[in-house]
């Protein structure tokens, strides 16, 4: 039961995390105008991975997409790539993990297959979470660098009485959403990997005992899942039994009233 709970919780946490990664990737507030030097601005700027926006104090907002691909900074392209890879891996991981869930029965899928799928999805979630965290961190580093550079240049070349205040950008909400979402996906992935260990059958090896009964030979074979898949070419006079040990969790083949699909 603990393994099912761990797997289910891992799936839910990863699902929330990936939803967060998608949300962060789509959000426009990756960087927002720093209002420290100009708290009374009537025009507020913020930027995302795909477009930049200007919100006027009158309430009107205008957003413009980055319609160039080659003209964009390499770092921004890298962040986009990391986030997209994170989303794709996470989506595949979710798909795999749905079929790996113990509470969902698909045909006569063996527990070893479910264990492998759980591990695969867990690894995918971990990589997805790392991609998101890396993407957000690269962007944050880019912001910090630009922030201090623009601070240094803020009042240079003023010349006369006219003051030109350079717009500085600071961390936007999307960065925090991305960090949290990446962390959740990572945690979900780790939980899936932990659940995989509980799902994997313990292969207890017994000595093969063969005895002859009247007219029929019955072989008791060791090897857990390897003994038979149920689709073997069994001869008429020979029965093959699964002699493997089952864990407490594996006894529950069908969903109980506490497991929801």
């Amino acid at each position: 039961m603990a393994v099912t709970a761990c797997q289910g919780l891992g799936f839910v946490v990863s699902l929330i995390g990936i939803a967060g990664i998608i949300a962060a990737t789509c959000m426009d507030q990756w960087s927002t105008q720093d209002l420290y030097n100009n708290p009374v601005t009537a025009v507020f700027n913020y930027q995302g991975l795909w477009r930049s926006c200007v919100r006027e104090s009158s309430g009107f907002t205008e957003c413009r997409g980055y319609f160039t691909l080659l003209g964009l900074p390499a770092m921004l392209q890298a962040v986009r790539a990391l986030m997209i890879v994170g989303i794709v891996l996470g989506a595949i991981g979710l798909l795999v993990s749905i079929f790996a869930l113990k509470c969902i029965r698909i045909g006569s899928m063996e527990d070893s297959a479910k264990a492998n799928m759980t591990l695969t999805s867990g690894i995918m979630f971990i990589v997805s979470g790392l991609c998101a965290i890396a993407g957000v961190s690269v962007f944050a580093n880019m912001l910090v660098t630009n922030f201090w550079m623009s601070t240094a240049n803020m009042y240079t070349g003023m010349g006369g009485m006219v003051q030109t205040v350079q717009t500085r950008y600071t961390f936007g909400a999307a960065l925090f959403v991305g960090w949290v979402a990446g962390g959740l996906t990572l945690i979900g992935g780790v939980m899936m990997c932990i659940a995989c260990r509980g799902l994997a059958p313990e292969e207890t090896n017994y000595k093969a005992v063969s005895y002859h009964a009247s007219g029929h030979s019955v072989a008791y074979k060791p090897g857990g899942f390897k003994a038979s898949t149920g689709f073997g070419s069994n001869t008429k006079n020979k029965k093959i039994y699964d002699g493997g040990a089952r864990t407490e969790d594996e006894v529950q083949s069908y969903p109980s009233k506490h497991d929801y699909v």
Partner: antibody
Framework: QVQLVQSGAEVKKPGASVKVSCKAS????????MNWVRQAPGQRLEWMGQ????????KYNGNFKGRVTITRDTSASTAYMELSSLRSEDTAVYYC???????????WGQGTLVTVSS | DIVMTQSPDSLAVSLGERATMNCKSS????????????LTWYQQKPGQPPKLLIY???TRDSGVPDRFSGSGSGTDFTLTISSVQAEDVAVYYC?????????FGGGTKVEIK
């Protein structure tokens, strides 16, 4: 069509308060900031403050040192501007104006003359 | 506060002539986010409230004749009336729409010679 109709002229004594109203029609009153701008005789226009009728959020010009209070009654689509501790230099025409794209004032009331005299 | 300085104080032109007036701000009104200048021009005729002419330094409001045009960027702006008509006699104000408090210029009075 958009219309902003202001209350009539007022004569006040120094130290008193005045409350000017501005009734809006022809648009969604709650969705646009309403501003108050005054113009003293022979002087430039001076922005006093604004209110967002949707939630009552306000912004004021600090030069008025807290003497201005802007309120609204959304059910009546009316904005109000109250100026307290009146002085003779507060004698001016007071306008309400709708805030629009580009942070400009696209529609103005006809103006309310407030005279402060002892 | 941003100080808006208009010049000249008054301008006398003949009908059909070109009228040009200037507005200078103490700070740049150019927003880097959308590369727009947050400067507005108004026309005020005697006994009337101001009327919006141009916003974003060069965008004409709907219904404004195309003889009115705005130009400039950063701190220096110009309003041009290409061919002055009798109904253009008014005071023209520029406004900072970039930073609170929103401030206005002292105005330029346009008269007919």
């Amino acid at each position: 069509q958009v219309q902003l109709v202001q209350s009539g002229a007022e004569v006040k004594k120094p130290g008193a308060s005045v409350k000017v109203s501005c009734k809006a029609s022809g648009y969604a009153f709650s969705n646009y900031w309403m501003n108050w701008v005054r113009q003293a005789p022979g002087q430039r226009l001076e922005w006093m403050g604004q209110i967002y009728p949707g939630n009552g959020d306000t912004k004021y010009n600090g030069n008025f040192k807290g003497r201005v209070t802007i309120t609204r009654d959304t059910s009546a689509s009316t904005a109000y501007m109250e100026l307290s501790s009146l002085r003779s230099e507060d004698t001016a025409v007071y306008y309400c104006a709708r805030y629009y794209r580009g942070n400009c004032f696209d529609y103005w009331g006809q103006g309310t003359l407030v005279t402060v005299s002892s | 506060d941003i100080v808006m300085t208009q010049s000249p104080d008054s301008l006398a032109v003949s009908l059909g002539e070109r009228a040009t007036m200037n507005c200078k701000s103490s700070q740049s009104l150019l927003n880097s986010g959308n590369q727009k200048n947050y400067l507005t021009w108004y026309q005020q005729k005697p006994g009337q409230p101001p009327k919006l002419l141009i916003y974003w330094a060069s965008t004409r409001d709907s219904g404004v004749p195309d003889r009115f045009s705005g130009s400039g960027s950063g701190t220096d702006f110009t309003l041009t009336i290409s061919s002055v008509q009798a109904e253009d006699v008014a005071v023209y104000y520029c406004q900072n729409a970039y930073t609170y408090p929103l401030t206005f210029g002292g105005g330029t009075k346009v008269e007919i010679k």
